[in-house]
């Protein structure tokens, strides 16, 4: 048997994927365990393996079917299990109704690329991926800057509060390298979280013209 | 709806090996856990091996363990049955099964299928 405190974490990318992490204090780091999805309006369930991402945490993908499919609406619930093997039988060591919609992580920002770029300013645009169409523009986003000699930790974060791809950075000094990244977030959902942020974008800025009255 | 194409089965003299062949198409691969299963003549479909999603779980009929290997390669839609030290009461028609419940893959109902592959082993 396996004690200790367990945590069964899960989040809806908006279409066809539910990542899930369980954690377990004392767990078996050879234990094969799977997450079992049972959705209360489909005729499909899912499964998916659980991988080893740390010394007593496991990671899996349920893929519901092609990546842009829409594959569960605002009114559906799924149980979501983590069955593990002991012997020849499986014991169910985790369980959740999941309402996918109050779980929301949508997928990190694609397609990051500058639009315009100046001395002291530069206009980027970037995508969304896999999100779903019932959001419409009820999504957010946040952005930040990486200057030189800085953190990512210690860039501040800028906030769009609308769904607006597109961003002007201000105020960037001349001849400068910097690094970009954006992430999504819908307005819907009790628990929904952030976004990763997207890949770093780099950029340089235009150097200042010589000999030019300012 | 789920595609799968079996190949790789022939004749073999016994103690030979063969390797078989599933390649699917017609949705993501990576949702499904994958079997292999067989049938003789006049006899029921019978399990013979299975492989998770993730390609890290292993489990065989207790007649095959330590003779047959089943792996896939998600990059190539394909599962594989390396079969070694083949017996003559291993021919049969051999199938390949796919089903995103790993929970139900075995009770054959709700699987996809393919066509099936002859392996007839001659002693």
């Known amino acids: 048997a396996v004690n200790g405190t367990s945590q069964f974490t899960c989040f809806y990318n908006s279409r066809a994927n539910i990542s899930c992490v369980w954690s377990q204090d004392g767990a078996l780091q050879d234990t094969s365990c799977q997450v079992h999805a049972w959705p209360d309006r489909r005729r499909w369930n899912q499964t998916c393996e659980l991988l080893p991402v740390s010394q007593a945490s496991w990671a899996c993908n349920l893929i519901l079917g092609a990546p842009d499919s829409q594959k569960l609406t605002t009114v559906d619930i799924v149980t979501l299990r983590v069955l593990c093997r002991e012997g020849v039988r499986w014991r169910v060591m985790a369980i959740q109704d999941f309402k996918p919609f109050e779980n929301l992580r949508l997928m990190a920002p694609i397609s990051l690329q500058v639009v315009h770029v100046e001395t002291h300013r530069c206009n980027i645009s970037w995508e969304i991926s896999q999100a779903s169409h019932y959001f419409e523009r009820h999504l957010e986003f946040e952005a930040r800057t990486l200057s030189p000699g800085h953190t990512w930790e210690e860039a501040p974060l800028l906030t769009l509060k609308q769904k607006q791809e597109w961003i002007c950075l201000e105020t960037l000094t001349p001849d400068t390298q910097y690094e970009f990244q954006v992430r999504v977030k819908p307005l819907q959902g009790e628990f929904t979280t952030w976004s990763p942020w997207s890949q770093p974008l780099a950029f340089r800025t235009k150097p200042a013209a010589l000999g030019k009255d300012t | 709806e789920v595609q799968l194409v079996e190949s790789g089965g022939g004749l073999v003299q016994a103690g030979g090996s063969l390797r078989l062949s599933c390649v699917v198409s017609?949705?993501?691969?990576?949702?499904?856990?994958m079997a292999w299963f067989r049938q003789a003549p006049g006899k029921e479909r019978e399990f013979v091996a299975v492989v998770t999603d993730s390609g890290r779980t292993t489990e065989y009929v207790d007649s095959v363990k330590g003779r047959f290997t089943v792996s896939r390669d998600n990059a190539k839609n394909t599962v594989y049955l390396q079969m070694n030290n083949l017996k003559p009461e291993d021919t049969a028609v051999y199938y390949c099964a796919a089903n995103t419940d790993y929970f139900q893959i075995r009770s054959v109902d709700n699987n996809a299928w393919g066509q099936g592959t002859q392996v007839t082993v001659s002693s």
């Open positions: 017609g949705d993501v691969f990576v949702r499904y856990t």
